[in-house]
């Protein structure tokens, strides 16, 4: 093996690993195994993947590369990154969408489905929190209006006498005119 | 002790084929690669094909890839060479070895030798 | 492809005589200070039998009249005095890449 700089080739080693019946320099991340070097030390011979295939890391056994997922449709999934050579298909949610996990210990590669933000406005609420990796988190209501139940209501324009009393401390002001 | 037994070989027409069986014995099969050669009438030795212990990866020459299959298997201590497409020039005596590995450079020598099978091809 | 060739193509030397079979490779068969070439006899109607491995170590079994030296390229397989059995043809063989690839062979005989 020629130059200093060439990393040592024990078949311990990172750079090197035996495969058939040499020690052979691994393929680059984005290629597969066509054949293993034919001589110690030497290069293997690698492909570059096929459309719609990838390999992340440096590898040495992979003769295929592995198919790159298609982001669900029915789960309202779409591409956020596409698939390259070297990497995946990263699927998420569109704008105004966020990830309900299908599991209940949910990490990345955990399927998925997508779910609409809820819009606070139109619930005559305050956002809190805006929705990215959960649900927007819709705080009290907005000027105007008061907590009835689940929801908020508008301030009557009229008599008193159709506000509770909820109403009356938020709404009270608007009887003065 | 290390024996290497050959059968299959004979006499075949051009475009067919034949396959060729080494039983071993008298040594740990699994760990070696094993290795075919052949000698055409006359003529010298020509390395045809290895397989490698462990993966069994094969390995051929430009004269005889995509033609032979090279395959083992280690329940049964045996090597094989399935040979298709036959040729004339394809007749001689067909040696199966044993790889052995010296040392830590990845280095092989053919250490034991099967007696040898004959393949003639021929109309 | 490395390309071994032989010289001479054919040999006669008297019985006790010291005999010298020559292969050149058409690169060097050097790796990691180990140069990857064999030496084997092969007797009339017999499959091969190793005879030197690593350019200059003899293989067990194989009487001490026998050795090999050189390295890179050039390669000597030397049979210090030449006993009746010893008529075969001897080959070199190189393990540095694949192809494996073998000499032309030199026919050794008695004078």
């Known amino acids: 093996q020629g130059g200093t700089r060439s990393p040592r080739c024990d078949c311990a080693g990172d750079f090197h690993k035996k495969i058939g019946l040499f020690c052979c320099r691994g393929c680059p991340a984005g290629h597969y195994l066509k054949a293993p070097c034919t001589e110690p030390c030497g290069n293997s011979t690698c492909l570059v993947c096929p459309q719609d295939t990838f390999l992340a890391w440096e590898n040495h056994h992979n003769s295929e590369c592995a198919r790159c997922q298609a982001c669900d449709e029915q789960a309202s999934q779409v591409a956020l990154e596409n698939c390259s050579a070297v990497a995946d298909t990263r699927c998420g949610c569109k704008p105004g969408w966020f990830v309900e996990c299908q599991v209940s210990q949910c990490v990345s590669s955990s399927p998925f489905y997508c779910q609409p933000c809820l819009d606070c406005g139109a619930l005559h609420r305050h956002t809190r929190l805006l929705c990215s990796r959960r649900d927007t988190d819709c705080g009290t209501c907005l000027p105007g209006f008061y907590e009835h139940g689940d929801g908020c209501v508008s301030c009557p324009t009229s008599t008193l006498g159709s506000c509770p009393e909820r109403c009356a401390a938020v709404c009270g002001w608007r009887q003065m005119f | 002790e290390v024996q290497l037994v050959q059968s299959g070989g004979g006499l075949v027409k051009p475009g067919g084929s034949l396959r060729l069986s080494c039983a071993a014995s008298g040594f740990k099969f699994s760990s070696y690669a094993m290795s075919w050669v052949r000698q055409a009438p006359g003529k010298g030795l020509e390395w045809l094909s290895t397989i490698s212990d462990g993966d069994s990866y094969s390995y051929f020459p430009d004269s005889v890839k995509d033609r032979f299959i090279i395959s083992r298997d280690n329940a049964k201590n045996s090597l094989y060479l399935q040979m298709n497409s036959l040729r004339v020039e394809d007749t001689g005596v067909y040696y199966c070895?044993?790889?052995?590995?010296?040392?830590?450079?990845?280095?092989?020598?053919?250490?034991?030798w099967g007696q040898g099978t004959l393949v003639t091809v021929s109309s | 492809d490395i390309v071994m060739t032989q010289s001479p193509d054919s040999l006669a030397v008297s019985l006790g005589e010291r005999a010298t079979i020559n292969c050149r490779a058409s690169?060097?068969?050097?790796?990691?200070?180990?140069?990857?070439m064999q030496w084997y006899q092969q007797k009339p109607g017999q499959p091969p039998k190793l005879l030197i491995y690593a350019a200059s170590n003899v293989e067990s079994g194989v009487p001490d009249r026998f050795s090999g030296s050189g390295s890179g390229t050039d390669f000597t397989l030397t049979i210090s005095s030449l006993q009746a059995e010893d008529v075969a043809v001897y080959y070199c063989?190189?393990?540095?890449?694949?192809?494996?690839?073998f000499g032309q062979g030199t026919k050794l005989e008695i004078k």
């Open positions: 070895a044993r790889d052995r590995i010296y040392g830590s450079v990845q280095y092989y020598a053919m250490d034991y």
């Open positions: 690169e060097s068969v050097e790796f990691s200070g180990t140069s990857l």
């Open positions: 063989q190189q393990s540095r890449k694949l192809p494996y690839t």
